[in-house]
Each structure stands twice: as C-alpha cells, then as structure tokens.
C-alpha cells in the first residue's frame, strides 16, 4: 500500500523522499514518476537528478530541499484534483536490481472557502514558494541536519509500517533516510 | 592551502585551437569537479562545463559543445581545457573553478584565469 | 535554461551604507543560489552558498536570502574594499546561469 499525502487545490504539495549519498561528489541518480514504480525507471517522468544535478523537470515540479545532501522530496507548486494519484520516487543505485521505489499516494481536496481574509492568509499570499502543505514553513529552515539513518535492510519493514499519513509525517519530521554505501 | 594555478596567456589565430591548463594543489584532486567559465571583457560569467576527475564524466553547455574539451590528468592533478576553431568571440578570460560538494558545487576556489586573445 | 535576472546593474554607495541587491530567477531553483564578488583584475571569491551561508572568512555584514525564485544580497554596512562587482549564481541545474553583475560604486 502507498503512503498518502494531503494538499488542498491551490497549494504547493510535499512528498517525501530521501537517502544519504555514499559520497561526496557522487550522487545516486533519482527519478519521479506519475504513476506507480514499474519494474525499472519512472513512468512519466515530471524531474529526474543525476550525479550531481537537477537534470530534468517539467513546469510546476521542483526539489525544494536539500537534494545534494539526498533531500529528493518533491514539491508540486499550485496543484489542482488532476495532481491527485501516485507518485514514484526512484532512487537508482547502481547495480542490477538495486533500486529502491517507493509509492507515494497525492489526495488533493479542494480549498477551503474562508470568510475573510486573516494574517495567515496574508503570509500564504506574500510567500506562495516557501510553504509547504504540512506547515514547515520557509524552505530555508528545512535542513537535513543529524538525521537517524535507515539501512537498506530495514527498508520493507518501513514500507510496511507506513500505512497512515500521519505516520509518514513522524517520520518525515524525525527525518528517516536511506543510507546508500 | 588550495590553490588552482592556470597556464599563461594565449595569442592564437583565428582557426586555431589552443589548450589551457588548471593545476590543482592542497585537496584530494579526484574530490571535486572542476568547472570551467568564460568572462568576456567587461561582461558576466558562461558556465561551459565541468569534469569529475574521479571518473572522467564530463557535462558541458550547449553553447560550448563543440568548442571546448574537458579533460584531465589524475597523475599531476591537472585538469584541461581545449577549445577549438578560436573566432574573435572567444577572445576572453577563462576560469577553472573547484565545485565542492560541501558547498554545493558553487565554487569555493578559482583559478587566477588565462587570458585568450584570437587576432590575425 | 534558467535566467537570473540580477538589480540593479550599479549601485552608487558611501562608506556605512546599508544595500541591497536582487536576483531573480526565471523558475524555481531551490535555495541553490550562490553570490560571488569580483574586484577589478581579480577572480570571483564566493561569498554566499546555498542561498544563506556564508563561506568561511567572509565578514557578517555579507548576509544572502531567499528561496525559490527570489533572492536577496546585502551588505549591511560598506566598507571601501567593497567596491567590486556581485554576481548571482543559481547551481540547481545545468547550464549553471550568472546574473549581470552589480557593481558598487561611490556615490
């Protein structure tokens, strides 16, 4: 099952993924695909990462964090109930079969009609970009810092235990990895 | 301390090719890409392209695919630039450039720049 | 390729003043931004990497902001030895793109 992530029409969505780089200089190519992982690549690419760059994207998807220290999350900016559906997030670590995919399920609801304008609504206005759906506020305090890191071993039972979006966001915030090498 | 010693300056003829060299000293050579970046007189700063020493891999600018050639030698530590088939527009200052990963890939040391002219 | 539109192109300055310079890029480039200055006959020395850090042994009154499409540079209190040119740099994605430059001057 694919853990899901919330984001009303109109607001920028964040789905989450991250590894650690074996090494510096070497980064490990990642993909994101509308759709569910297949058995090799992304379908339908929207932004894709090499060695060291943002390689290829398409209009309103950007890597927001820190994506060369292995922050890969996905920012989709304005979304509408089309952006609904899976994502693929795709780290490709070289080696037959060594990819790791991972599912992330986009719901989008539609906005909230509020009677009037509050100072909430001001910032949202004034700072469109550096907000994200689940309120970490501007993207410059969003580091990936002393993470715990989770080796590949530990990966199938993560998938598993992450069944609530709730969930997800816990282990988002205490900032879980992959650790590549 | 890091230092990028790049080679003199060049007077060629139009047509011609020339090859620049950046020497890298005090860091792991094969640690860093090496990028390359023109400045025409009194103008901003092109990207044309980088070289990972490590394993050689190599990215260029549109713009500059073609003209320049990324190579290096891991044996001094030195990383080349050729650029081919000079015309006046390439009359200009080059710079080597360490990307470091710890300041994401920005660059954190320059090359003093070797300084092309292209005139018959 | 990403565009960074840098202002103003120069900045007429008196020694303690306060000054801001813009960059903005034509999309989204994270906080992958990077502020160089260059002093006549010189190479570019970073100043600024990943949007707000500043490198080891730059003074404070440098600072860099922003994220996203809209950055800010600024030096807090001028000193003669800044008179130079600043140049932005976004290093989210190849072609890596420079701003024009502004180049401090006195007033």
């Known amino acids: 099952s694919e853990v899901e992530y919330r984001a009303e029409v109109g607001q920028n969505a964040y789905l989450p993924c991250f590894y650690t780089p074996a090494a510096p200089g070497n980064l490990v190519p990642v993909c994101w695909g509308k759709g569910a992982c297949p058995v090799f690549e992304c379908g339908n690419v929207v932004l894709r990462t090499d060695e060291r760059d943002v390689n290829y994207w398409t209009s309103r998807y950007w890597l927001n964090g820190d994506f060369r220290k292995g922050d890969v999350s996905l920012t989709i900016e304005n979304v509408t109930l089309a952006d609904s559906g899976i994502y693929c997030c795709r780290i490709q670590i070289p080696g037959i079969m060594n990819d790791e995919k991972f599912n992330l399920k986009l719901v989008i609801k539609p906005a909230k009609v509020t009677p009037a304008p509050t100072r909430q609504r001001d910032f949202t206005a004034a700072f469109p970009r550096m907000l994200t759906t689940r309120g970490h506020g501007p993207a410059e305090t969003q580091t990936l810092g002393s993470l715990p890191d989770i080796n590949l071993t530990q990966i199938s039972t993560l998938a598993n235990e992450l069944r609530d979006s709730r969930l997800a966001n816990d282990l988002r915030d205490s900032g879980a990895t992959i650790r590549i090498g | 301390q890091v230092q990028l010693q790049q080679s003199g300056p060049e007077l060629v003829k139009p047509g011609d090719s020339v090859k620049m060299s950046c020497k890298a000293s005090?860091?792991?050579?094969?640690?860093?890409?090496m990028d390359w970046v023109k400045q025409s007189h009194g103008k901003s700063l092109e990207w044309i392209g980088y070289?990972?020493?490590?394993?050689?891999?190599?990215s260029y600018n549109q713009k500059f695919k073609g003209k320049a050639t990324l190579t290096v030698d891991k044996s001094s530590s030195t990383a080349y630039m050729e650029l081919h088939s000079l015309t006046s527009e390439d009359s200009a200052v080059y710079y080597c450039?360490?990307?470091?990963?710890?300041?994401?890939?920005?660059?954190?040391?320059w090359g003093q720049g070797t300084t092309l002219t292209v005139s018959s | 390729s990403i565009v960074m539109t840098q202002t103003p192109k120069f900045l007429p300055v008196s020694a303690g003043d306060r000054v801001t310079m813009t960059c903005k890029a034509s999309q989204s480039v994270g906080n992958n931004v990077a502020w160089y200055q260059q002093k006549p006959g010189q190479s570019p020395k970073l100043l600024i990497y990943y949007a707000s850090n500043r490198y080891t042994g730059v003074p404070d009154r440098f600072t860099g902001s922003g994220s996203g499409t809209d950055f800010t540079f600024t030096i807090s209190s001028v000193q003669v030895e800044d008179l130079a040119v600043y140049f932005c740099?976004?290093?989210?994605?190849?072609?890596?793109?420079f701003g024009t430059g502004t180049k401090l001057e006195i007033k």
């Open positions: 450039a360490r990307g470091g990963y710890y300041s994401y890939y920005s660059y954190d040391y």
């Open positions: 005090g860091y792991t050579f094969t640690d860093y890409y």
């Open positions: 070289i990972y020493p490590n394993n050689g891999g190599t």
């Open positions: 740099q976004q290093h989210y994605s190849s072609p890596y793109t």
